[in-house]
């Protein structure tokens, strides 16, 4: 293995060798393989516990996987000069537990971060504002992947998981230009009503496996240049009226229903005339009934009015125990 | 009562094709999938692909997507699977089940053999 | 894709005993189903959504688990209940995925 001060374009990667010497800018920090040439550093599967700090400056993409950080401080990536051209960081899988406001400061050019399949019991409301004004300036983010951050039961704070994830990305209306999110896996049992009003630009918003319910107080309205909203494999029952009104306003959406427990009572007649004549939704045939026991495994786009009745609510006088 | 009626056995000689059928009764074909299910003696249960009656629309299992093709007859409310360039692999028995979370209704399979 | 896989393969109970049989899951899933098998017939859809019976199942079978890890039990043995039992994925979109099975006999 070369040591990092060696910069041979022969090989792609060079390991570096620990140095007692103070970091040279193009340096290769322990542990880590760099390629100046495709300007990425790989400090993967190492069990490093903090951000390594001679980072090279020349460094596009930062690969720092399957690590143990438990804490990503503020400021963890500042640097003197800055990491100007740092635009994509992958920090999966690294044991985060805390993510502290302004961890991404100074870091002008971050265009995708991934924090998936870390138990963040603690992210700060700023971590991707850096400032707790009620308007930071914009981040430099398009995409932030955050698959499988919800932290095991008893790691969880007091406030709800998903109120912790909001504040996040609504703090100081940073996030403007964001155009891909992903929040797959995390337990949602609902989404916070005001998140996606400061998303306008979201092309890409995935809540797949999650366990959100109902959409009735969320709006999708503003999300005009949306292309694909995934909500597979949720609990989803039924979409009413004004879910369905805004998802066929979105002038380019594909959305996905996949593997939701649908309901086919009464309440589901709506839904059913909508996916008849809508093109918006993808592989709208495989929608199919799970309850009530006699509709189950039915598809929906075969269902009339007719099928659709709900139990009459017996007045308490004709109940029985 | 729901019932899925497939004949109990057919026979055929390698490298042909044979169009296996599953005669549906007691519900409203279209409005469920039907699926196919090939099980080897002694061993389980291997999902090969479904179809929906109502648009022919079908899903595949990779592993099938060059030997079975899926398709249906409304108007008898029979589904069918063709099963292209026989071997003994393909001996077995062949089940349609009525499905979509579950299969909730089966077929009594058909018995496949491929011999010359 | 999800892989289920069964345990034991094979066991053996005797009239009145419990038996218990597991189905794990590579990844989690949020229920599963299991449909039994006698010997010549076809499978039966048995117990879905991990705990609900199938009409006409006996209220000595029942279903339980999530996340990864799902089970059948039997609180007493009977002949009849001899049989494979396979488990299956809750999906409503390819694949659908089985266990492998097991196979459970009288003594």
């Known amino acids: 293995t070369s040591s990092a001060s060696s910069s041979s374009s022969s090989a792609p990667f060079l390991a570096s060798a620990a140095s007692a010497q103070p970091p040279l800018p193009d340096q290769c920090p322990a542990l880590c393989e760099c390629s100046e040439a495709a300007r990425t550093v790989k400090c993967v599967n190492r069990n490093l516990t903090e951000v390594p700090t001679d980072l090279p400056l020349y460094v596009r993409n930062l690969f720092l996987t399957g690590n143990q950080l438990a804490v990503l401080p503020a400021g963890a990536f500042a640097r003197r000069p800055p990491l100007a051209e740092l635009a994509a960081l992958n920090l999966s899988g690294s044991r985060l537990d805390e993510v502290r406001g302004g961890a991404f400061e100074h870091l002008p050019s971050l265009r995708q971060l991934d924090l998936s399949h870390n138990p963040l019991a603690y992210l700060s409301p700023f971590a991707f504002s850096g400032s707790n004004a009620s308007i930071s300036a914009p981040s430099p983010l398009v995409e932030l992947i955050l698959n499988h951050i919800v932290p095991p039961d008893d790691k969880r704070q007091n406030r709800s998981f998903e109120g912790m994830v909001a504040a996040a990305l609504v703090a100081g209306r940073a996030l403007q230009g964001l155009h891909l999110l992903e929040l797959a896996s995390n337990h949602f049992l609902y989404l916070p009503r005001d998140v996606l009003a400061q998303l306008p630009s979201l092309r890409y918003l995935d809540l797949s496996n999650n366990s959100l319910v109902s959409l009735t107080y969320v709006s999708f309205r503003n999300l005009t240049h949306l292309e694909s909203l995934h909500l597979e494999d949720n609990a989803l029952k039924v979409l009413h009226n004004g879910t369905l009104a805004e998802l066929q306003g979105l002038p380019h959406v594909r959305v996905f229903l996949d593997n939701n427990p649908w309901v086919c009572d009464c309440h589901m007649a709506d839904m059913v005339t909508w996916l008849k004549q809508t093109g918006v939704v993808q592989g709208k045939d495989r929608l199919t009934c799970a309850f009530p026991e006699k509709m189950r495994n039915r598809v929906l786009l075969e269902l009339n009015s007719a099928d659709l009745d709900c139990d009459p609510i017996l007045p308490p006088s004709l109940q029985t125990s | 009562q729901v019932q899925l009626q497939q004949p109990g056995t057919e026979l055929v000689k390698p490298g042909a094709s044979v169009k296996l059928s599953c005669k549906a009764s007691?519900?409203?074909?279209?409005?469920?999938?039907m699926h196919w299910v090939k099980q080897r003696p002694e061993q389980g249960l291997e999902w090969i692909g479904n179809?929906?009656?109502?648009?022919?629309?079908?899903n595949y299992n990779e592993r099938f997507k060059s030997k079975a093709t899926l398709t249906v007859d409304k108007s008898s409310s029979t589904a069918y699977m063709q099963l292209s360039s026989l071997t003994s692999e393909d001996s077995t028995v062949y089940y349609c089940?009525?499905?979509?979370?579950?299969?909730?209704?089966w077929g009594q399979g058909t018995t496949l053999t491929v011999s010359s | 894709q999800v892989v289920l896989t069964q345990s034991p393969a094979i066991m053996s109970a005797s009239p009145g005993e419990k038996v218990t049989m597991t189905c794990s899951a590579s990844?989690?899933?949020?229920?599963i189903h299991w449909y039994q098998q006698r010997s010549g017939t076809s499978p039966k859809r048995w117990i879905y959504?991990?705990?609900k019976l199938t009409s006409g199942v006996p209220v000595r079978f029942s279903g339980s688990g999530s996340g990864t890890s799902f089970s059948l039990t039997i609180s007493s043995m009977e002949a009849e209940d001899a049989a494979t039992y396979y488990c299956?994925?809750?999906?409503?979109?390819?694949?659908?995925?089985f266990g492998g099975g097991t196979k459970l006999e009288i003594k």
């Open positions: 959504d991990t705990s």
């Open positions: 990844s989690s899933v949020r229920y």
């Open positions: 089940a009525r499905g979509g979370w579950d299969f909730d209704y």
């Open positions: 007691g519900y409203t074909f279209t409005s469920y999938w």
């Open positions: 179809i929906n009656p109502s648009n022919g629309n079908t």
């Open positions: 299956q994925q809750w999906t409503s979109k390819p694949p659908w995925t």
